[in-house]
Interface confidence: low
């Protein structure tokens, strides 16, 4: 199979007027641009506080970015007749601070949605599955983008962020078709460890630019379809024996795991090891040590274990103050 | 794998009819939107038909509304294009396209193609 791009990206766009007559099913809203040809719908940066409601039925790609839409109420997008083709959805950078449950309902085609950049200080766990079932109706989405959503320290509901998106992510299993999951630069100090249990269709992770420490309780053995994990620029220190044999069964990953404060001591000697002979990592040489400070930029494939030490740990009555 | 298989071209009279089959494999079929596309000797690719998840909205190239009818039996995992009354101007390659998600993955799929030729 080979990729190709389908839709026009030349078609022209028309600018919609204002009008008071009401609008007929393929007029464009006020403040978008439309192009029938390529079925995209722009209201871009025009500082909407509503998602528009006449929206023409042809949309398949709807960009609603840079707007001020704060809250995102269930239904958001529904309408009568459907937007039944509607595939790509972009709200990034749209000052949302609230995703209702149920707020992507009647979309049967949406396939990509976009809410990166907005400050979610709350995400209803029944965001994308739409129900508070234990089993939904599977969600049509394949590529959820959630990248840098976390709100700023003073908007924080008082459970995890993590928690938060970890549960809009598992609810009623809807996401099991979801081939792609980008959620860096949020903050996150952990993985919840039930989240990747239920997206096994997943094919690209990106984890990117996190605070993430460990992976000790994260489980990869069912992301058999995986082909890209995104790891870099988090605090992992090391990768243990668990972690490494995961990856090393997942038959089609690539790990990406630059810049990470990696700490090279006796109980970096598995991963030493692992990295001299997997295929799994993507520019594994380029990967050095952060600590301790005898050993600041040491590459990790050119040391051995004589190299990897710890300092004993003594009794409470020898140690020195 | 995805998988991608078109069947049922071949040689017709104008006025005759055609059904092309698409068979997918190696995805949710049932998820996704599917299109048929054509590309005529010395031409540019055409948007034909496409067909929304459930098969509940259909949209057609104004050049085969009334004549073409675009269907799908998720159940089966095939894409179907009906093609009556028959041109000799739609003699072309079709292809099925499965459009998974434009974005990282290179996720637009298509098939080999079916050549459908329209002479007397």
């Known amino acids: 199979t080979s990729s190709a791009s389908s839709s026009s990206s030349s078609a022209p766009f028309l600018a919609s007027a204002a009008s008071a007559q009401p609008p007929l099913p393929d007029q464009c809203p006020a403040l978008c641009e439309c192009s029938e040809a390529a079925r995209t719908v722009k209201c871009v940066n025009r500082n909407l506080t509503e998602v528009p409601t006449d929206l023409p039925l042809y949309v398949r790609n709807l960009f609603l970015t840079g707007n001020q839409l704060a809250v995102l109420p269930a239904g958001a997008f529904a309408r009568r007749p459907p937007l039944a083709e509607l595939a790509a959805l972009n709200l990034s950078g749209s000052r949302l601070d609230e995703v209702r449950g149920g707020a992507f309902e009647h979309l049967p085609s949406l396939r990509q949605l976009d809410l990166s950049h907005n400050p979610l200080a709350y995400l209803s766990p029944f965001a994308f599955s739409g129900s508070n079932a234990s089993i939904s109706a599977p969600s049509p989405l394949v590529e959820l983008i959630l990248n840098h959503i976390v709100p700023p320290d003073d908007k924080r509901q008082n459970r995890s962020f993590e928690g938060m998106v970890a549960a809009a992510l598992v609810a009623g299993r809807a996401l099991q078709g979801l081939h792609l999951l980008e959620l860096a630069s949020n903050h996150f100090l952990y993985l919840p460890r039930d989240v990747l249990a239920q997206l096994p269709s997943l094919r690209y992770l990106d984890l990117s630019n996190n605070s993430l420490v460990s992976l000790t309780y994260v489980s990869f053995r069912n992301l058999t379809h995986l082909e890209s994990l995104h790891l870099e620029d988090n605090a992992l220190k090391v990768l243990h024996n668990g972690t490494l044999a995961e990856l090393q069964g997942l038959p089609h990953v690539r790990v990406f795991l630059d810049n990470n404060p990696w700490v090279c001591d006796c109980h970096m000697a598995d991963m030493v090891t692992w990295l001299k002979q997997t295929g799994v990592v993507q520019g594994k040489d380029r990967l050095t040590c952060a600590f301790p400070e005898k050993m600041r930029n040491r590459v990790l494939l050119e040391l051995n274990s004589a190299d990897l030490d710890c300092d004993p740990i003594l009794p409470p009555s020898l140690q020195t103050s | 794998e995805v998988q991608l298989v078109e069947s049922g071209g071949g040689l017709v009279q104008p006025g005759g009819s055609l059904r092309l089959s698409c068979a997918a494999s190696?995805?949710?079929?049932?998820?996704?939107?599917m299109s048929w596309y054509r590309q005529a000797p010395g031409k540019g690719l055409e948007l034909v038909a496409s067909?929304?998840?459930?098969?509940?909205?259909?949209r057609y190239a104004d050049s085969v509304k009334g004549r073409f009818t675009i269907s799908r039996d998720n159940a089966k995992n095939t894409l179907y294009l009906q093609m009556n009354s028959l041109r000799a101007e739609d003699t072309a390659v079709y292809y099925c396209n499965a459009e998974l998600g434009p974005r990282r993955l290179g996720m637009d799929y298509w098939g080999q193609g079916t050549l459908v030729t329209v002479s007397s």
């Open positions: 067909i929304t998840t459930a098969g509940g909205s259909t």
């Open positions: 190696g995805f949710t079929f049932s998820s996704y939107a």
